[in-house]
């Protein structure tokens, strides 16, 4: 167990041209607050996926009123740290989202209004117990400067907060096989209570005899890296031999959602849909009022004046969830054309186009014939984002640069012999056959079946195919 701590140093205009307008004015004074969302591993940074490591809201900053004509300065910030407690091991790699929110304090009907000013996201590696890490992130014309760290809560220590420390029983040294707990040199590492052989790097335990794995590791001793590439089922528990996830109980079995929340499986875990008044990964957080700003993404909070009365978030179009924290899946309408892959980035839809297509919705079939010449009189033919050449007689290959052997396909029927000719091919027919391809038998009475031989040309003469 431990705490992730975030210290916001400044939020204001970034360098370069196009300084943003101040978010507050004399007519609409406002104050800022921040929300941080943490997810384990290098997971997707989509704002609507659950903050599985935890989330926190800052206090409100001081009220700010823009001075007329002055450029937007760094805005006054809330006091204190944002703290996100984590119950399990610190994962070492994590994704974060930091949102800057504006609370307008004008005389709006129904109380203050909230709007999202900026959202930054990133993926980082961080060992618990290390020094503060500094970061600068830009969102549009805004710049956010902050520091963060993860620290373990006693008795936990270590880079993942999985080792336990206890006060020394003897003043001089620790017991046999137990090391001092740096940096708490007056404490000793607690006796190992995990299952024997449990990986010290990738496993941890909270109960004697168990071995729980950090993300990306599996097996009874957490020694097998997870590899789902050759696996069929998306569910655990894990196979100790292959590292494959094999069928087992679903993540919603036993309903991990508290306070009447309903559980739905996601590709990697589960998701709780919480009743009003509750939020958190397992709907475990309650006592929230509208003053806490529980509605995200511009949702309007109504009711909930005190912790005993539930609030309601009225979500703007495109958002849902009891706290407007989830985005509606707009990609399910399949807006991308020509097999493009749809990505919902939150502020916009993006299409990743297949080769040969372009445009915001992959609507443009790239003209592959543009600037592509087919040699020797060939013509370029479009098709499916690729091009091919339809070659003139006697030529072949991708660009009609290769001289084709017209006799390669054995065009002369009934044993006729083929001769290449500058304008095509000539068939010398076997006795009893005639025609450009020796396709017509000559009747015994001398009359051909079809067509009649041209004047001056006897059956059996070579016939040139024009």
């Amino acid at each position: 167990a431990g705490v992730f701590e975030l210290q916001i140093h400044s939020f204001g205009p970034g360098p370069g041209p196009g300084a943003p307008r101040s978010p507050c004015s004399a007519r609409l004074p406002c104050r800022l607050f921040f929300r941080v969302c943490l997810k384990p591993g290098l997971s997707e940074e989509a704002a609507e996926s659950p903050c599985a490591l935890g989330a926190a809201l800052s206090a409100r900053g001081p009220v700010y009123t823009e001075q007329p004509g002055a450029p937007a300065p760094d805005l006054p910030l809330p006091d204190g740290l944002l703290q996100v407690p984590f119950r399990d091991a610190w994962p070492g790699t994590f994704s974060f989202i930091i949102e800057t929110w504006r609370e307008e304090l004008g005389d709006q009907i129904g109380g203050p209004a909230w709007s999202l000013l900026a959202r930054v996201a990133g993926r980082r590696r961080l060992a618990a117990g290390g020094p503060w890490a500094r970061d600068i992130q830009r969102a549009g014309a805004w710049e956010l400067r902050f520091s963060y760290r993860a620290r373990c809560e006693p008795p936990a220590v270590g880079t993942a907060c999985t080792r336990l420390c206890r006060p020394r029983s003897a003043p001089s040294r620790c017991g046999p096989g137990l090391r001092p707990c740096a940096p708490l040199e007056d404490e000793c590492e607690a006796p190992l209570v995990c299952r024997a052989g449990c990986s010290p790097e990738h496993g941890f335990c909270e109960q004697p005899g168990e071995c729980r794995c950090l993300e990306g590791w599996t097996g009874p001793l957490c020694t097998v890296p997870v590899s789902t590439s050759s696996c069929l089922s998306p569910r655990g528990p894990s196979s100790a031999t292959t590292g494959c996830l094999v069928p087992g109980p679903g993540p919603c079995d036993g309903n991990p959602c508290a306070n009447g929340g309903s559980c739905s499986e996601t590709p990697r875990s589960f998701e709780c849909t919480c009743p009003r008044g509750f939020y958190g990964l397992r709907c475990e957080v309650s006592g929230v009022t509208c003053a806490d700003g529980p509605c995200f993404n511009g949702g309007l909070c109504v009711g909930g004046a005190d912790p005993d009365s539930a609030y309601i978030c009225h979500c703007p179009p495109g958002f849902q969830g009891s706290n407007c924290e989830k985005r509606v899946d707009r990609c399910s309408l399949q807006p991308c054309r020509n097999g493009g892959l749809c990505l919902d980035l939150g502020h916009a839809l993006r299409c990743r186009c297949r080769a040969g297509f372009a445009g915001p919705r992959c609507e443009h079939d790239l003209d592959d014939c543009a600037g592509r010449a087919c040699a020797n009189g060939g013509t370029c033919v479009e098709g499916g984002g690729a091009h091919r050449c339809s070659c003139a007689l006697g030529f072949g290959g991708r660009d009609c640069r290769e001289r084709a052997d017209p006799c390669a396909a054995r065009p002369c029927a009934h044993g006729g012999r083929c001769y290449a000719h500058f304008s095509g091919l000539v068939c010398a027919c076997a006795p009893g056959y005639m025609g450009a391809r020796c396709e017509f038998p000559v009747h015994p009475d001398g009359a051909s079946a079809l067509p009649a031989a041209p004047p001056g040309l006897r059956p059996g003469d070579p016939q040139r195919y024009l």
Partner: nanobody, 120 residues
Framework: EVQLVESGGGEVQPGGSLRLSCAAS????????MGWYRQAPGKQREMVAG???????IYAESVKGRFTISRDNAKNTVYLQMSSLRAEDTAVYYC??????????????WGQGTLVTVKP
């Protein structure tokens, strides 16, 4: 600005039918994709039926054979004919459209929703 206006919702008995309409208006150069979503109380919003960017029709598994989507391109309007309605079809039905504006940008828009209630 683009507006999507839904109509046709109401209360109906199980087995009954309703026809929803959604008309798009505003600075629209073209409509790329358009269709219907629904959201039942306490549930996630889900796609019901639509015309994709490629012009194909798609349906949620739960409504196939019962709902039919159609459109009038001249009026920038889509319709959802709902037959053999069931209690589980009760929801707010939202029109959605991916639109190319006169600026040539694409934007995704939502209607305000129309309530469909199926009860005996």
């Amino acid at each position: 600005e683009v507006q999507l206006v839904e109509s046709g919702g109401g209360e109906v008995q199980p087995g009954g039918s309703l026809r929803l309409s959604c008309a798009a208006s505003g600075s629209i150069l073209s409509i790329n994709a358009m269709g219907w979503y629904r959201q039942a109380p306490g549930k996630q919003r889900e796609m019901v039926a639509g015309f994709t960017g490629d012009g194909n029709t798609i349906y949620a598994e739960s409504v196939k054979g019962r709902f039919t989507i159609s459109r009038d391109n001249a009026k920038n309007t889509v319709y959802l004919q709902m037959s053999s309605l069931r209690a589980e079809d009760t929801a707010v039905y939202y029109c959605a459209a991916d639109v190319q504006l006169f600026s040539r940008d694409y934007e995704f828009y939502w209607g305000q929703g129309t309530l469909v209630t199926v009860k005996p």
